[in-house]
C-alpha cells in the first residue's frame, strides 16, 4: 500500500483582481466518502491555515461563510479558488487532503503552489 500522493501545480499567477485558481489532485488509496481539504500558506518556516472544507464525495465543498476560498470537486480532483489576494499574499500555498471516512484515515500533502500576486497599478487621473 502506497502513501497518498497529492499533486498541485508548481506556479500560478493571480489575476489582476487578486483571484488565483488551481487544481489539487489526490491518488486515493481507498474509496473515501468524506474528504477534508485544507489550504495552507507557508512563509519562511511558518505554516498558517488559509481555509478548510469537508465534503461528501459528489457534493460541493462547503467553506466557512467568511472564507476567501471557494471550490468544486470532481472525483479525486478539487478545483480551488482563492480570492482577495494582494501582493503581500504572494507565497507557497499547500493543498492538504485527508480521507476522513470510511476508515482507514489517510493524509496527503502536496508540494505547494507558488502563487504570485501583483497589485494592479492605480489608474492615472484623466483630464477631460
Amino acid at each position: 500500500c502506497k502513501a497518498m500522493h497529492v499533486a498541485q501545480p508548481a506556479v500560478v499567477l493571480a489575476s489582476s483582481r487578486g483571484i488565483a485558481s488551481f487544481v489539487c489532485e489526490y491518488a486515493s488509496p481507498g474509496k473515501a466518502t468524506e474528504v477534508r481539504v485544507t489550504v495552507l500558506r507557508q512563509a519562511d518556516s511558518q505554516v498558517t491555515e488559509v481555509c478548510a472544507a469537508t465534503y461528501m464525495m459528489g457534493n460541493e465543498l462547503t467553506f466557512l461563510d467568511d472564507s476567501i476560498c471557494t471550490g468544486t470537486s470532481s472525483g479525486n480532483q478539487v478545483n480551488l479558488t482563492i480570492q482577495g489576494l494582494r501582493a503581500m499574499d504572494t507565497g507557497l500555498y499547500i493543498c492538504k487532503v485527508e480521507l476522513m471516512y470510511p476508515p482507514p484515515y489517510y493524509l496527503g500533502i502536496g508540494n505547494g503552489t507558488q502563487i504570485y500576486v501583483i497589485d494592479p497599478e492605480p489608474c492615472p487621473d484623466s483630464d477631460f
Epitope: 502513501a3 498558517t48 469537508t54 484515515y105
Partner: antibody, heavy 118, light 106 residues
Framework: QVQLQQSGPELVRPGASVKLSCKAS????????INWVKQRPGQGLEWIGW????????IFNEKFKGKATLTVDTTSSTAYMELHSLTSEDSAVYFC???????????WGQGTPLTVSS | DIVMTQSHKFMSTSVGDRVSITCKAS??????VAWYQQKPGQSPKLVIY???TRHTGVPDRFTGSGSGTDFTLTISNVQSEDLADYFC????????FGVGTKLELK
Amino acid sequence: QVQLQQSGPELVRPGASVKLSCKASGYTFTTYDINWVKQRPGQGLEWIGWIYPRDGSIIFNEKFKGKATLTVDTTSSTAYMELHSLTSEDSAVYFCARRGLLGPLDYWGQGTPLTVSS
Amino acid sequence: DIVMTQSHKFMSTSVGDRVSITCKASQDVATTVAWYQQKPGQSPKLVIYWASTRHTGVPDRFTGSGSGTDFTLTISNVQSEDLADYFCQQYSSYPTFGVGTKLELK
C-alpha cells in the same frame, strides 16, 4: 506561546468512568486537531484518537472505540476525554497533544496519570 | 495498521559521539514521519517532522533522513541533555509509534 494544560492525577475504582481535561492556550483552538495518547509505565505511546474542534469530527483508533469519548468546549478552548468501564489495563499516563497543520504532534500537555485500583 | 519498528531498544553513546537511531515502516509512508524525544517524567517533545525538518528550537545537531519505509534520526556531537527515549511516528494514516529507543551513556 502554545500551551496544553491537563487535569491532575486520578485514582478511580474498577468499573467506574473518569473525565480528563486539556485546556489549550496561545493559538486558535478550532484550527488544530486535539489528539489523545496513552502511555503505560515503561512502555511506548499508543494513539487513542483525535477531535477537530471546528466541527467536532472524530477519528478513532478502533481499539479505543467504546472505551473513550472525546468532546470539546470551544468557548473555554478545552478538550475532554472520558474513559469508561475502567480496568487495571487503563492505568497509564494520558497525554493530549495538538496536531500541527502538517501532521505531526507539535505540542503536548504534561500528562494526566490515571490509576485504576480497588 | 502501519507498524513502526525500532529494532534497537537501547543504544549506548558517549558525550561528543555521533549516533543514529533507525526506524522502519511496514509500508510506504513517503516522508510523513516524526521523531519525538521523551525524558523521564516528561511529555514527548517533537524533534523532527516530515522526516527531515527540525521543529522550532531544536539544535542543528539533530538531523532526520529517509523516505518510503526507512528512516534515521542522527544526533551528532551528543550532549548529556540528549540522553532520553526517542520515538518515531508515522502520520500517513492514523498515527502509530515505534516502541522507542533509549539513548544512554556507555
